[in-house]
């Protein structure tokens, strides 16, 4: 039994880091493998993660972490019974994938303006809380070409757009994702999408 693709890990910078790797053949990850992880920290203790299958030869493990600070460094040991298959380390602050924003809502009752709001996925005491920026994706269910991205570079989790920038009388969907420049993170997953019917009053033409 050998590791074909070494574990790579990303952290949500809160409580979970996710590590993925591939074995050289079909493996029952949860029965055959264990990933031990330990904070490099005087008198810390090792924790065991039981991996799950992620495709035939792929494994994934969700490492539970008690908060994250920038100095954190973990040792990782991948075991198959008594055999050490791989040894490595992981610094969560250097491999951050933020949590996805939630509770995306489209408010259509503001005069001819669409107000999109969502929730910051972090609590106020987390470092990322004040460092997230967002991308909002809006697309038409009827017209695949009608697809747009709005970059929200301010901290407030909201976006205002004129309803007239979208076509009237058709349904749209929106979703939002986040990233943090300070840790050069990857983008989060997209939030669940929300749907609304776009309608607005066309301005009267003057003759």
């Amino acid at each position: 039994m050998k590791v074909l693709q070494e574990p790579t890990c990303v952290s949500d910078y809160m409580s979970i880091s996710t590590c993925e790797w591939k074995m050289n053949g079909p493996t029952n990850c949860s029965t055959e493998l264990r990933l031990l992880y330990q904070l490099v920290f005087l008198l810390s203790e090792a924790h065991t993660c039981i991996p799950e299958n992620n495709g035939g030869a792929g494994c994934v493990c969700h490492l539970l972490m008690d908060d994250v600070v920038s100095a954190d460094n973990y040792t990782l040991d991948l075991w198959a019974g008594q055999q050490l298959l791989w040894k490595g380390s992981f610094k969560p602050s250097e491999h951050v994938k933020p949590r996805a924003p939630g509770n995306l809502t489209v408010h259509t009752n503001v005069s001819d303006t669409l107000l999109l709001t969502w929730s910051n996925p972090y609590p106020p005491d987390n470092y990322l809380y004040n460092h997230l920026t967002y991308a909002v994706n809006i697309w038409s269910e009827n017209d695949p070409a009608d697809f747009r991205i709005y970059n929200v570079t301010y901290l407030e989790p909201s976006l205002r757009i004129a309803a007239s920038t979208l076509k009237s009388g058709i349904s749209y969907r929106a979703r939002v994702r986040a990233w943090a420049q300070c840790y050069n993170t990857t983008w989060s997953e997209w939030s669940p999408s929300t749907k609304w019917h776009n309608s607005y009053r066309e301005p009267f033409e003057q003759h």
Epitope: L39, V40, F41, L42, L43, S44, E45, D66, D67, V69, S70, A71, D72, N73
Partner: antibody
Framework: EVQLLESGGGLVQPGGSLRLSCAAS????????MHWVRQAPGKGLEYVSG????????YYANSVKGRFTISRDNPKNTLFLQMSSLRAEDTAVYYC?????????????WGQGTTVTVSS | EIVLTQSPGTLSLSPGERATLSCRAS???????LAWYQQKPGQAPRLLIY???RRATGIPDRFSGSGSGTDFTLTISRLEPEDFAVYYC?????????FGQGTKLEIK
């Protein structure tokens, strides 16, 4: 209420021995790394020793290595420091402290201290 | 072994003023954790800041920590009468624990 209560301090002659105890209440000792920190009269804080939550791994400052032994009795929720070959420079208030991994080495709970005096 | 040096040894200020206490490590400590404690006469120390910049439970927001590498700072934005005490920095690393020698913050 979370509390640590040290006992066992006193006056001892150079070369003598003493055993300090620390009774924990309001939390489970086995969930935390536990440490001893001391403070000589009019001086600053000095780290002495620590022990991991369950594996029993220990660490000692160079100044006490080979003379002091830290141990714990998790079922009794008690931490110990066995001190031998005591020297005048070991005279101090000894504090029992808790370290929460979440606090990354920050010692969030301290006992009131027990005084050890090494003198002839 | 890493040595922590605190400065100044004594800081004389008045209530309402801003206090800046320094802690310098003898070598870079990128994978270690810096904490700050307050100690009043006859009392055990109290944890103020851990992980360089995070306030411990119940600590007022006038206390803040910052720094990286070798230089760390504890700032008290607006001194209250109860803040006059001795302050210690502490480094908790992979293989050692070290305290600074302390800074005494006294009323001017």
């Amino acid at each position: 209420e979370v509390q640590l209560l040290e006992s066992g301090g006193g006056l001892v002659q150079p070369g003598g021995s003493l055993r300090l105890s620390c009774a924990a209440s309001g939390f489970t000792l086995s969930s935390y790394a536990m440490h001893w920190v001391r403070q000589a009269p009019g001086k600053g804080l000095e780290y002495v020793s620590g022990i991991s939550p369950t594996s029993g791994s220990t660490y000692y400052a160079n100044s006490v290595k080979g003379r002091f032994t830290i141990s714990r009795d998790n079922p009794k929720n008690t931490l110990f420091l066995q001190m031998s070959s005591l020297r005048a420079e070991d005279t101090a208030v000894y504090y029992c402290v808790r370290v929460k991994v979440r606090y990354r080495g920050g010692m969030d709970v301290w006992g009131q201290g027990t005084t050890v005096t090494v003198s002839s | 072994e890493i040595v922590l040096t605190q400065s100044p040894g004594t800081l004389s200020l008045s209530p309402g003023e801003r206090a800046t206490l320094s802690c310098r490590a003898s070598q870079s400590v990128s994978s270690a954790y810096l904490a700050w404690y307050q100690q009043k006469p006859g009392q055990a120390p109290r944890l103020l800041i851990y992980g360089t910049s995070r306030r411990a439970t119940g600590i007022p927001d006038r206390f803040s920590g910052s720094g990286s590498g070798t230089d760390f700072t504890l700032t008290i934005s607006r001194l209250e009468p109860e803040d006059f005490a001795v302050y210690y920095c502490q480094l908790y690393g992979a293989s050692s624990v070290t305290f600074g020698q302390g800074t005494k913050l006294e009323i001017k």
